[in-house]
């Protein structure tokens, strides 16, 4: 039962995890007009890794898309395929975990196919959120850089009167969500790593249970079932007999009415 | 179409106080700032403040900060300017103009005229 | 703030003539998210309220005559009135509408002879 949870919470946790990745790479706002001293301001600047957005204090906003691919700078390109990366791992492995929740019976797919899957989704989920993570914070880096380069260049060129005020960014909301997200994906891909070493039956699983069927004794001994490491199924683990006793574990393995096929 | 309809002219005694109210039809008065500008005889136009009737928030020149306040009434589409401890430095032609795109006052009232005299 | 200067303070001229006034700003108007310049034009014509002619330092407003143009970058802006006519008797005034407070210029009276 304590497998089933924890597959069960990875799977969610990681389904929020990539759900928050997917909208921090679509927000606008990776980094905002820094409003240093002063808290009001007439035009307001943000940006984000597909366009820039400019809102007016009449509530005016104009968006422009960043039309070009090779103008851009290298450390934006290379968050934008961070995210994408993220995203696409993320995604495959949400679908892998799909099949490989406990509480899906699909045909006659054993335990250990189900084990190699939650462990392959866990690995998926794990780098997902490092892609993630890493991507928010190389941008989070290129914005302090660019943040204290600006402000030693606060006031350049003034001639005479006339002052260029240059616009400073700070971190943008997109970042939080993004490292949150991250994380998210994170632990739940861990908990799915998790889950799979509780899925993967063990030697020390069944005592040794004498069955009688149909006039013949057949019994399940002890090394019966391994571990499997691979992918894929194996046909040597495969279980013949319906017995009357089973692991906690195993009770939820036996079709029922509420089963998706 | 946008009509901005400002109440009539006042004559006030100094350290009186007045308020004066801008009428809105024909847009949704809760989603546009509404600006106050005045302009005394024979000089220039001066930004008091600007209220956003949506949720009340205000902006102000400091210059009328204290002497100016601004509200306004959803429900009847009207901004007002509440202008306290009036002086003769006061007397002035008080409009109200809309917030639009761009930045812009692109409607004003026709403006009220508040004379300070004893 | 910002301060508007606008010169020439007044100026007389013929109609059909083309009439140029100028406007500087203390920081630049210029914001870099959009490269658009937040500088305004307004005339205001004797008894009246004050009626916007452009944004965006030279975006017309729907209805201004094409006489009317805008120009300018940064801190340097121009209103140029191409062929004045008659009814373009009025006071023109530029107006900061980058940061707050909004700040206008002092106005140019224009005169016709």
């Known amino acids: 039962m304590a497998v089933t949870a924890c597959q069960g919470l990875g799977f969610v946790v990681s389904l929020i995890g990539i759900a928050g990745i997917i909208a921090a790479t679509c927000m606008d706002q990776w980094s905002t007009q820094d409003l240093y001293n002063n808290p009001v301001t007439a035009v307001f600047n943000y940006q984000g890794l597909w366009r820039s957005c400019v809102r007016e204090s009449s509530g005016f906003t104009e968006c422009r898309g960043y039309f070009t691919l090779l103008g851009l700078p290298a450390m934006l390109q290379a968050v934008r395929a961070l995210m994408i990366v993220g995203i696409v791992l993320g995604a495959i492995g949400l679908l892998v975990s799909i099949f490989a929740l406990k509480c899906i019976r699909i045909g006659s797919m054993e335990d250990s196919a189900k084990a190699n899957m939650t462990l392959t989704s866990g690995i998926m989920f794990i780098v997902s959120g490092l892609c993630a993570i890493a991507g928010v914070s190389v941008f989070a880096n290129m914005l302090v850089t660019n943040f204290w380069m600006s402000t030693a260049n606060m006031y350049t060129g003034m001639g005479g009167m006339v002052q260029t005020v240059q616009t400073r960014y700070t971190f943008g909301a997109a970042l939080f969500v993004g490292w949150v997200a991250g994380g998210l994906t994170l632990i739940g891909g861990v908990m799915m790593c998790i889950a799979c070493r509780g899925l993967a039956p063990e030697e020390t699983n069944y005592k040794a249970v004498s069955y009688h069927a149909s006039g013949h004794s057949v019994a399940y001994k002890p090394g019966g079932f391994k571990a499997s490491t691979g992918f894929g199924s194996n046909t040597k683990n495969k279980k013949i007999y319906d017995g009357g006793a089973r692991t906690e574990d195993e009770v939820q393995s036996y079709p029922s009415k509420h089963d998706y096929v | 179409q946008v009509q901005l309809q400002q109440s009539g002219a006042e004559l006030v005694k100094p350290g009186a106080s007045v308020k004066i109210s801008c009428k809105a039809s024909g847009y949704a008065f809760s989603n546009y700032w509404m600006n106050w500008v005045n302009q005394r005889p024979g000089k220039g136009l001066e930004w008091i403040g600007q209220i956003y009737p949506g949720n009340g928030n205000t902006n102000y020149n400091g210059g009328f900060k204290g002497k100016a306040t601004l509200t306004a009434d959803k429900s009847s589409s009207t901004a007002y300017m509440h202008l306290n401890s009036l002086t003769s430095e006061d007397s002035a032609v008080y409009f109200c103009?809309?917030?639009?795109?761009?930045?812009?006052?692109?409607?004003w009232g026709q403006g009220t005229s508040v004379t300070v005299s004893s | 703030d910002i301060v508007m200067t606008q010169s020439p303070s007044s100026l007389t001229v013929t109609a059909g003539e083309k009439v140029t006034m100028s406007c500087k700003s203390s920081?630049?108007?210029?914001?870099?998210?959009?490269?658009?310049?937040?500088l305004t034009w307004y005339q205001q014509k004797p008894g009246q309220p004050p009626k916007l002619l452009i944004y965006w330092a030279s975006t017309r407003e729907s209805g201004v005559p094409d006489r009317f143009t805008g120009s300018g970058s940064g801190t340097d802006f121009t209103l140029t009135i191409s062929s004045v006519q008659a009814e373009d008797l009025a006071v023109y005034y530029c107006q900061n509408v980058y940061s707050y407070p909004i700040t206008f210029g002092s106005g140019t009276k224009l005169e016709i002879k």
């Open positions: 103009a809309r917030w639009g795109t761009g930045n812009t006052m692109d409607y």
């Open positions: 920081q630049s108007l210029l914001n870099s998210g959009n490269q658009k310049n937040y």
